[in-house]
Interface confidence: low
């Protein structure tokens, strides 16, 4: 008969390292009689033999991690006892060795000039991975402002333009490397006046560029201010080239006035904004003529040849220099302003425009224009441009002019002759009378007017603006 | 290694139907858009449908509207496509493809992995 | 919808020549733009995305860039690998276009 014998491990455990998701198996050989019962343990805290996460065979000598955790780091040990002297226990490390993994990747970032950014990079690993940053395709160096901090982010202080790119960190240790996808930061810069307007002293009825030039990141947009309100004549050209915007205020000049040039960039919810201001003065302003006077004759030109009735004398205003080519000048702008509207309201617009600005004109001693009927003006603005001019209107209250669309001269309504007064005192539009039975769907419009008198128009989608000057109401 | 599988290609009859599917494995598919692009024989390529797995949002081309629709399966890292009503006209190689970030970034991202293809043919 | 018209549809050009293709879009697209380079039989493989950066791993001589709502593709020297049909894609808005491809063949 065999002798009762204690139990002495014969191959103690030893640090074990494993890869997460991989097998790691701990090796705890016993010599002993009778057979003894081995345990195991984790942190000093006992492993349950029905745990599904290990495996333990041999006779409770094999343990086996069957798929490593990273918090399976820590201190395995095997105690083994049968009974016969003393229990032993040998002990051993598993280290979790993990490949780099970056768990809070960075994001685009929008930041402006001057400020602090932090691209975040937070990575796990064992070892610990290192992490360096790439900017498009160099390997990003740290200087006094540029760092990589203890958690793998990047902090820049004191943004520069030149910062703005394509980064993307590298987390890399023994076991490999991994990539953050790349992100952009963007330098974002408060709108900045290059060059400010001049301010310039003319003659009555004299053309006149205003020219502001402004920088920022995103590009800003300019608009102007006619003695505080937007302007209300003139034409305005834009061009945008690196960065730099340049406005050109054109303005035909039978008033003195203060222009100022307000240059915005939006960052985020904020917006940043630069002003500029010149005056433009008129030599001998109080000899002017500042009283509307003029003369009846045939028209002549060619933009509204299509549109006024064959023949017919129109009232052109002396208090213009040269009347019938500055009126021309101004249907002309106006024209090309109204490339941008909806095919149903560009006719009836020109029709308005045409009419309002070369008047159907009696001669007599005094020549008198004859204005638009209000009902043919209520007519353009509330139902053939109804939707243009929303636009208009909300661009208006938030200051937003991006083109001369809101340069249109057009007429205020409320201060035409009504036709219920006198229907020979105001010159009727034909167009809006020939279109009317053409017209079968229904826009979502009000009218104060009854809806058997007026056409129903579909609503459009293009812009019309108009200068707040002449509001039709 | 990042991959995208297609499958569920073949032969159909007109008005018919087929699911393709789109199997992705090597990257973090929670946080790609998938896009279904074909080819017909000897043509261009043309967008069918898009997904964003951040949101969930769909987007199809005119062409295809109301007759495909486009899903994704998080948890089995598998976009699908589901083709009804087909035509003889949307007989071409389907491809999937990914670009990286939800559907707004991702326009700026590029395409960068696409599947090998599986060809659909409608015709009786 | 967004429409990209490329051209030309096909160019015959040397080894060691300097090619360019053009993409015109119907409407601003902002830079999302990608052009993408597809030989017979396999998938298209992405070389340029946001208008004109380079994607990882494709030659330098691929450059990419953008003049209002024209973009485009320039190989600096052509190599024989190059021949391929390319194609430019915008997803500026919500509906993705491609445009019609320009086949890069040998003179």
């Known amino acids: 008969e065999k002798l009762p014998k204690a139990p002495v491990i014969t191959t103690p455990l030893e640090t074990v390292d494993a890869l997460v998701e991989e097998v790691a198996t701990f090796m705890c050989a016993v010599e002993s009689y009778p057979q003894p019962e081995i345990s195991w343990t984790r942190n000093k805290i006992l492993i349950k033999l029905f745990d599904t996460r290990y495996s333990i065979r041999e006779n409770g000598q094999l343990l086996t991690i069957l798929s490593v955790e990273d918090s399976d780091d820590g201190i395995y040990c095997c105690i083994a006892n049968n009974g016969v002297g003393g229990a032993v226990e040998s002990c051993g490390a598993l280290q979790v060795k993990m490949k780099p993994k970056i768990t809070r990747p960075p994001i685009n970032v929008k930041i402006i000039e001057g400020l602090k950014a932090v691209l975040p990079c937070t990575t796990m690993g064992n070892p610990k991975p290192s992490v360096s940053w790439i900017k498009g395709d160099n390997a990003l160096r740290e200087n006094s402002r540029i760092a990589v901090l203890e958690s793998g982010s990047l902090r820049i202080h004191n943004v520069q333009k030149e910062d703005a790119g394509q980064y993307r960190c590298v987390a890399k240790n023994s076991l490999g490397t991994a990539y953050s996808k790349l992100v952009k930061l963007e330098v974002e810069v408060f709108a900045r006046i290059l060059r400010a307007p001049e301010s310039h002293n003319v003659t009555f009825g004299s053309f006149v560029t205003l020219r502001c030039t402004a920088i920022g990141i995103p590009v800003p947009t300019i608009s102007w201010i006619e003695n505080g309100n937007a302007v209300s004549s003139g034409s305005i050209q834009e061009s945008v080239k690196d960065r730099v915007i340049d406005s050109r205020l054109q303005l035909f000049i039978t008033k003195p006035g203060l222009y100022t040039c307000i240059a915005t960039n939006k960052h985020g919810e904020k917006f940043s904004t630069a002003k500029a201001a010149a005056t433009v003065s008129i030599a001998e302003w109080s000899k002017s003529q500042k009283d509307s006077q003029g003369y009846c004759a045939q028209y002549r030109g060619e933009v509204c040849d299509a549109v006024l009735a064959k023949d017919a004398l129109v009232f052109f205003n002396t208090s213009y220099r040269d009347p019938e080519d500055a009126q021309e000048l101004l249907i002309h702008t106006a024209w090309n302003e109204l490339k941008a509207v909806s095919p149903l309201c560009r006719p009836a617009a020109e029709a308005l425009l045409c009419n309002h600005l070369f008047q159907e004109c009696s001669p007599g001693v005094v020549p008198t224009p004859m204005p638009i009927c209000r009902e043919y003006c209520l007519a353009v603005k509330e139902l053939f441009c109804a939707k243009e001019w929303q636009a208009m209107e909300g661009k208006a209250h938030r200051g937003l002019y991006r083109s001369g669309m809101h340069l249109l001269p057009v007429p205020e309504c409320s201060k035409l002759p009504s036709m219920h007064r006198d229907p020979t005192a105001c010159t009727r539009l034909p167009y809006l009378d020939y279109k009317k039975e053409n017209i079968t769907t229904f826009p979502s419009i009000t009218s104060s007017r009854p809806s058997a008198d007026i056409p129903n128009l579909p609503a459009s989608t293009s812009s019309f603006a108009v200068s707040p000057a002449y509001s039709m109401t | 290694e990042v991959q995208l599988v297609e499958s569920g290609g073949g032969l159909v009859q007109p008005g018919g139907s087929l699911r393709l599917s789109c199997a992705a494995s090597?990257?973090?598919?929670?946080?790609?858009?998938i896009h279904w692009v074909r080819q017909a024989p000897g043509k261009g390529l043309e967008w069918v449908a898009s997904i964003s797995s951040y949101s969930g949002y769909t987007y199809y081309a005119d062409s295809v509207k109301g007759r495909f629709t486009i899903s994704a399966d998080t948890s089995k890292n598998t976009a699908y496509l589901q083709m009804n009503s087909l035509r003889a006209e949307d007989t071409a190689v389907y491809y999937c493809?990914?670009?990286?970030?939800?559907?707004?970034?991702?326009?700026?991202?590029?395409?960068?992995?696409w599947g090998q293809g599986t060809l659909v043919t409608v015709s009786s | 919808d967004i429409q990209m018209t490329q051209s030309p549809s096909s160019l015959s050009a040397s080894v060691g020549d300097r090619v360019t293709i053009t993409c015109r879009a119907s409407q601003s697209v902002s830079s999302a733009v990608a052009w993408y380079q597809q030989k017979p039989g396999k998938a298209p493989k992405l070389l340029i995305y946001?208008?004109?950066s380079l994607y990882s791993g494709v030659p330098s001589r691929f450059s990419g860039s953008r003049s209002g709502t024209d973009f485009t593709l320039t190989i600096s020297s052509l190599q024989p690998e190059d021949f391929a049909t390319y194609y430019c894609q915008q997803s500026s808005s919500s509906l993705i276009t491609f445009g019609q491809g320009t086949k890069v063949e040998i003179k």
């Open positions: 090597g990257f973090t598919f929670s946080s790609s858009s």
């Open positions: 493809a990914r670009t990286y970030g939800s559907y707004y970034v991702s326009s700026y991202t590029g395409m960068d992995y």
């Open positions: 946001s208008a004109s």
